[in-house]
């Protein structure tokens, strides 16, 4: 099971002092959101027990494997369900803590109930403040059962759940009708997926016989040990005030584990620490009792004394849970409760035993999960013990499980089961990822998903030029950091592969799939300079440049011209794809715009240094429109147009253009040039009699300007059909242009 503990501090006089801490003993736990260890999550779960909204709770991370939740402002903030999630991948595990209000109408006699599939579970809610009304039981927030208040037995409302199945698991509550949900008794029911003493997919495997209140996990057969106990079968007690799968964690504060509730992965649930009991875990065990919630009885024999944390402390000459075994009986010594080896390794396993008569090599044997018995290849005999060494044949996955060391002498026999985990070395499922490249180096992310088992102890990156038969170069890197491969050849493809290792002999996995990474071209180093430029129109610019003369071939594929329009915040890029080019025509520019211009050499995707910039002002486009255009019929074939010059001219007008069109006509308009720009009047001749015409005009400097307003006028009647309009200009009357 995952080594994950959720601690609740139950000193409830002041909710602001209340805290929840989630502690992980897993390697690499909580390091962050990378492939090597997702973070610990600790949160209040409001899906079932909803409480009034309050200020947000504060989450504090203490190192890599601990997270604490604080900031409770009132007792109601505490009521409900809290969860901690830890572990990576398939081992991701949620630990749940259910908090009851000490002032609730109904209180649970026992919060966590772990039962086997098919058992009858009985939830008991004790009356704390009586109400003469119905009691409603809910399961995961939905209605489940109703009791009349008369149905209380000895001040308790009982909910019997016969033949429970795993889907019956969840949060149960008992509430008086019309009472606040915060006054409910909340329970957690955990239903193991198998009957008592069994585990595995078909519940065909036998549990190891967990001691001291440990619970056999229905998926992997491991004992989830109560806080304060360790070992494959929870056979060893931790020192007072310690917890965790290896007793590696210490209870905070001077009073040890007093006032703390410990929640462990299912199917264990929650309990007080070893040596403590009561709804707030503040009461020491009564004499003769020990362990989590003081649920265990010592029953020590042969002069043993009861320690409320560890159980029987045996006098010299005796051992066993109740001091019932004489030291004359052989005894397995200091056997590790769990060993880990890598697949296909051939490890040596030692098993030490003592006793009277003294065990010899042939009296110690090792039994594998499939029943195969191994005999020791050698034994080391010391005054106080014999250590037998077993050479294990090449390990396969089926060797995972409970092994047993057994000693037999004429004085009796002893055996010790221990768990062997056969781990599969990790193999990358994907190639490493290229982050950035330069001409002589590649920056690579080695973090890839993998098959097999973690944790990852080392990452090796193997690389060599593509299609090469030379030896691979290898670099050993930190799993969590990006790697820079240096001193490479420019514009060269490299085959790159990852190899992952896990701890222990034979932990190196196979190489992952290769990927091709290509170094960049050499960077172009020459800096061009702008020789000159000239405007070829309002939107056209001819640019020329030069390069310094250097020996050898030119490193470059072409030039990049950049025009920066600072007013509009726009950049225009023009690619000149010949490295021999020294001039370029830029078209489609915006007239009247102030540009900053530079040029740089490029090679592949790399840009060389830019030339010093030049500042270019394009002339504006055509002039503004003529003003106050007016048409006046003179005869049946002539109309006079008058106007005023445009304002704010950027230069001298070269000509005017008049557009003539028959009103409502479908044909193209006729354009007539007025080549004397000083004129402010012209006569359009050759028009048809009694015909309505539309006129507009514009000026030209270097380009044509904006059109004026359109005016309408009709020729006078009864004339002959004309050949077509022509114009005659004349100077305006004095002062007309003012």
């Amino acid at each position: 099971a995952v080594d994950l503990t959720l601690l609740a501090n139950l000193r409830l006089t002041d909710p602001q002092r209340f805290f929840l801490t989630c502690v992980s003993g897993e390697a690499g736990a909580g390091r962050g959101s990378d492939a090597w260890g997702p973070p610990l999550l600790l949160e209040k779960d409001d899906r079932i027990v909803r409480t009034p909204p309050g200020p947000p709770l504060r989450l504090a991370r203490n190192g890599s494997h601990q997270v604490t939740l604080r900031g409770f402002s009132k007792p109601s903030d505490l009521v409900g369900v809290f969860s901690c999630v830890g572990g990576a991948g398939a081992r991701r595990t949620r630990v749940i803590y259910v908090h009851n209000s000490p002032g609730a109408h109904l209180l649970p006699d026992k919060v966590t109930h772990t039962v086997n599939k098919g058992d009858t579970a009985v939830l008991s809610a004790r009356v704390h403040k009586e109400k003469q009304t119905d009691v409603i039981w809910k399961s995961n927030g939905s209605y489940f059962y109703t009791l009349d208040w008369h149905e209380a037995q000895d001040g308790r409302f009982l909910l019997q759940l016969p033949n429970v199945q795993p889907p019956s698991s969840g949060i149960y509550s008992a509430t008086y009708l019309e009472a606040s949900p915060l006054g409910s008794a909340f329970f957690r029911l955990i239903v193991r997926g198998c009957g008592a003493g069994r585990w595995g997919p078909g519940c065909t495997k036998e549990c190891p016989g967990c001691l001291h209140g440990g619970v056999c996990h229905d998926h992997d057969g491991e004992c989830v040990c109560p806080p304060g106990f360790t070992g494959t079968r929870c056979e060893q007690a931790c020192r007072e005030g310690r917890f965790g799968q290896s007793c590696q964690e210490q209870c905070p504060g001077i009073s040890g584990c007093r006032g703390l509730t410990f929640c462990l992965p299912d199917p264990y649930g929650c309990s007080c620490g070893s040596g403590w009991r009561g709804s707030q875990c503040q009461e020491a065990c009564a004499p003769g009792h020990f362990g989590a919630d003081c649920r265990l009885q010592c029953q020590c024999q042969n002069g043993g004394t009861c320690d409320r944390f560890s159980g029987c402390v045996c006098p010299s000459g005796w051992h066993g849970v109740h001091c019932e075994k004489s030291d004359r009986i052989p005894q397995i010594l200091n056997m590790a409760s769990e060993l880990e080896f890598n697949l296909e390794t051939m490890p040596r396993i030692n098993c030490a035993a003592a006793g009277n008569p003294f065990p010899v090599r042939g009296s110690i044997e090792l039994r594998k999960p499939d029943g195969t018995v191994l005999l020791s290849t050698k034994a080391i005999v010391e005054p106080e013990k014999t250590t037998a060494e077993f050479e294990v044949p090449r390990l396969v996955l089926a060797d995972s499980g409970f092994w047993e060391c057994r000693v037999s002498t004429s004085g009796g026999q002893d055996s010790r089961r221990f768990k062997v985990n056969v781990k599969v070395p990790p193999v990358p499922l994907a190639a490493p990822r290229l982050l950035t490249k330069q001409s002589r180096q590649l920056v690579v992310s080695p973090l890839v998903s993998f098959s097999g088992d973690g944790p990852i102890s080392t990452v090796r990156l193997h690389y060599r030029p593509q299609d090469s038969t030379m030896d691979w170069s290898t670099i050993v890197v930190d799993p969590s950091e990006n790697v820079t491969l240096m001193n490479l050849r420019p514009k060269t493809g490299y085959s790159v592969r990852v190899q992952l290792s896990r701890p222990g002999e034979g932990g190196e996995g196979a190489w992952g799939p290769p990927t091709l990474m290509t170094t960049d071209c050499p960077e172009p180093l020459l800096q061009p300079w702008l020789e000159g430029w000239h405007v070829e129109g309002t939107d056209r610019l001819r640019v020329s440049w030069s390069l310094p003369l250097v020996p050898g071939p030119l490193v470059g594929d072409g030039f990049l011209l950049r025009l920066w329009d600072g007013t509009r915040g726009q950049e225009r890029r023009e690619n000149v794809s010949s490295p021999q080019a020294r001039t370029a025509l830029l078209t489609g520019l915006t007239p009247g715009t102030h540009y900053q211009l530079d040029v740089q050499l490029y090679h592949c995707t790399l840009l060389g240094p830019a030339s010093p910039p030049a500042h270019v002002l394009l002339p504006p486009s055509g002039p503004p429109a003529p003003r106050h255009l007016h048409a006046q019929a003179l005869s049946d074939s002539e109309i006079q147009l008058t106007w005023k010059h445009p304002e704010a001219l950027p230069g001298p007008i070269s000509k005017y253009v008049v557009e003539v069109q028959v009103a409502g006509g479908a044909g193209d308009p006729l354009w007539i040039d007025v080549d004397r720009p000083e004129e402010t009047s012209t006569i359009i001749r050759g028009l048809n009699a009694s015909t309505r015409y539309l006129f507009r005009m514009r000026a030209s400097i270097q380009g044509l300007g904006d059109w004026s307003n359109t005016v309408e006028e009709s020729t006078l009647g009864n004339g002959l059909q004309a050949e077509g309009p022509v114009q005659e200009s004349r100077a305006a009357e004095e002062g007309l242009d003012q």
Epitope: Q132, D134, Y145, D148, E178
Partner: antibody, heavy 117, light 110 residues
């Protein structure tokens, strides 16, 4: 799908007896309080009796107390109403209904009881 | 047993909203509990639960039906009236005392 089906109604003389049944399906019958409600022709609804899931506690309207008995058989998913000493004013459509906390969330289609000489 | 008082009839046009009131006589029913429910009954049919716990709607009931409570009076509001809303409506309240349990219905509102 929750279903409640009443049966046992009919014509009975004043002073006579009748036993109504209500067959339940589609839910865990043994977890819910059950209720009988009646409706006299052209009149409103009148609560008659309630029984708790265990069957151990029962309550009655004053108008039927001492004459009617509510019971249940959780193994058969069936609710009963034993009606004795029937009177003309007991003439009504009798509905069984499932109690959920403090509401009646599912009702049967009803069975007509007519008390007449 | 005293009943809960409702108006004998309420009318409205399609698309309009109407409100039916339900007034209790003691703190044992509407005023004292948040356990008022509303039922709809079409002629010749069984009653159907529309609202429970004053304002909660069972799944499958249109959100045009809503409930509320103020003091000793509960209310059912039907918005966007449809022809199919024409029916009898009853309020109900679960009444609990130390010695009895009962269920009280209001006088019908057409």
């Amino acid at each position: 799908e929750v279903q409640l089906l009443e049966s046992g109604g009919g014509l009975v003389q004043p002073g006579g007896s009748l036993r109504l049944s209500c067959a339940a399906s589609g839910f865990t019958f043994s977890n819910y309080p059950m209720t009988w409600v009646r409706q006299a022709p052209g009149k409103g609804l009148e609560w008659v009796s309630r029984i708790y899931p265990s069957g151990g506690y029962t309550y009655y309207a004053d108008s039927v107390k001492g004459r009617f008995t509510i019971s249940r058989d959780n193994s058969k998913n069936t609710l009963y109403l034993q009606m004795n000493s029937l009177r003309a004013e007991d003439t009504a459509v009798y509905y069984c209904a499932r109690g959920r906390i403090a509401a009646l969330d599912y009702w049967g289609q009803g069975t007509l009881v007519t008390v007449s000489s | 047993q005293s009943e809960l008082t409702q108006p004998a009839s309420v009318s409205g046009s399609p698309g309009q909203s109407i409100t039916i009131s339900c007034t209790g006589t003691s703190s044992d029913d509407v005023g004292g509990y948040n356990y008022v429910s509303w039922y709809q009954q079409h002629p010749g049919k069984a009653p159907k639960l529309l609202i429970y716990d004053v304002s909660d709607r069972p799944s499958g009931v249109s959100n045009r039906f809503s409930g509320s409570k103020s003091g000793n009076t509960a209310s059912l509001t039907i918005s966007g009236l449809l022809a199919e809303d024409e029916a009898d409506y009853y309020c109900g309240s679960y009444r609990v005392t130390s010695v009895s349990r009962s269920y009280v219905f209001g006088t019908e509102t057409k």
